[in-house]
Interface confidence: low
């Protein structure tokens, strides 16, 4: 069946050195346990975390992100999905692509990071 | 239903420049990958380059760096191919190719009709 | 970037006959091959991706084999509108790359 990928609509801000999380549905939410469900930085696709198969596939991962992430799939039987981003760093800083993939049927969602420094924000005093 | 309409055939001299456009109908223009690939004549396909419209930002394979622009316009749904420097070895044929989301991990399932460039003094 | 040899570059065969071209890659890829088929003044035509799933609407007689560096396309009974060019392409790595191609004849 058709879906659509809903992301964020806003950016999602984060403290260097803090962890961070994307969230990613589908709509109409529907079981996803059997997709394919990723998030990749464009252009061209480093790949940030990639659940296929029923399982995580890490060898796929870009080396920058191998160790951080995880993926939160306590709903994912409803179509929803989070991509936990640990140790966040400047360089993780832009765009990031979700996608699901249900047999050839693929559908993706936009959306950006912001990451700033903790310590701009420390008031004086 | 997803079509790429490339723009007419062109010839060229040494030296100049020439510009491509693949305008896409059907889909959602912004999610797509656009890449170039050329064919000279009798010879096998060469990927150029790409992008990802909703993003901008093109990746060029690294024997055109620097003599080839991929950009797009999400507004008309087009997608540009600049070469310049033109030799005579550029005289190929110029598609334009989509993936769904990105060309890492998905392949191209759609094509132009191809853009004939002709290189001669 | 990655390297991909198809072999061989040119195949005669008849109608019915069993064809099989090879394509090789210079480095794992995983599963991330397509094949495509371009006849003479048109645009290639998408297969086969993910190394062996078929492209909706392709007949079944085509299937792609293979992971890691070698991988096969198999036309089952070639029929008269199979004989084409035949490319492999790697989408593995952000620098896309073809195989040279293979030529099928009439023999």
């Known amino acids: 069946g058709q879906f659509r990928v809903i992301g964020p609509r806003h950016p999602i801000r984060a403290l260097v050195g803090d962890e961070v999380e994307l969230p990613c549905r589908i709509s109409p939410g529907k079981n996803a346990t059997g997709m394919e469900v990723g998030w990749y930085r464009p252009p061209f696709s480093r790949v940030v975390h990639l659940y296929r198969n029923g399982k995580d596939q890490d060898g796929d991962q870009a080396p920058e992100y191998r160790g951080r992430t995880e993926l939160l799939k306590d709903a994912i039987g409803e179509g929803k999905v989070t991509l936990r981003i640990r140790n966040v760093r400047f360089s993780d800083e832009g765009g990031f692509t979700c996608f699901f993939r249900d047999h050839s049927y693929q559908e993706e969602a936009a959306m950006e990071l912001k990451v700033e420094d903790p310590f701009y924000w420390v008031s004086p005093g | 239903q997803v079509q790429l309409v490339q723009s007419g055939a062109e010839v060229k001299k040494p030296g100049s420049s020439v510009k491509v456009s693949c305008k896409a109908s059907?889909?959602?223009?912004?999610?797509?990958?656009i890449s170039w690939v050329r064919q000279a004549p009798g010879q096998g396909l060469e990927w150029m380059g790409g992008?990802?419209?909703?993003?901008?930002?093109?990746n060029y394979a690294q024997k055109f760096q620097g003599r080839v622009t991929i950009t797009a316009d999400k507004s008309t749904s087009t997608a540009y191919m600049e070469l310049s420097s033109l030799r005579s070895e550029d005289t190929a044929v110029y598609y334009c190719?989509?993936?769904?989301?990105?060309?890492?991990?998905?392949?191209?399932?759609?094509w132009g009709q191809g853009t004939t460039v002709t290189v001669s003094s | 970037d990655i390297q991909m040899t198809q072999s061989p570059s040119t195949l005669s065969a008849s109608v019915g006959d069993r064809v099989t071209i090879t394509c090789r890659a210079s480095?794992?890829?995983?599963?991330?091959l397509a094949w495509y088929q371009q006849k003479p003044g048109k645009a290639p035509k998408l297969l086969i991706y993910?190394?062996?799933s078929l492209e909706s609407g392709v007949p079944s007689r085509f299937s792609g084999s293979g992971s890691g560096t070698e991988f096969t396309l198999t036309i089952s009974s070639l029929q008269p509108d199979d004989f084409a060019t035949y490319y492999c392409?790697?989408?593995?790595?952000?620098?896309?790359?073809f195989g040279q191609g293979t030529k099928v004849e009439i023999k």
């Open positions: 392409q790697q989408y593995s790595m952000d620098h896309l790359t």
């Open positions: 992008i990802i419209p909703i993003f901008g930002t093109a």
């Open positions: 993910d190394a062996s």
């Open positions: 190719a989509r993936a769904p989301y990105s060309p890492t991990y998905y392949p191209f399932d759609y």
């Open positions: 059907g889909g959602t223009f912004s999610s797509y990958a």
């Open positions: 480095q794992s890829i995983s599963s991330w």
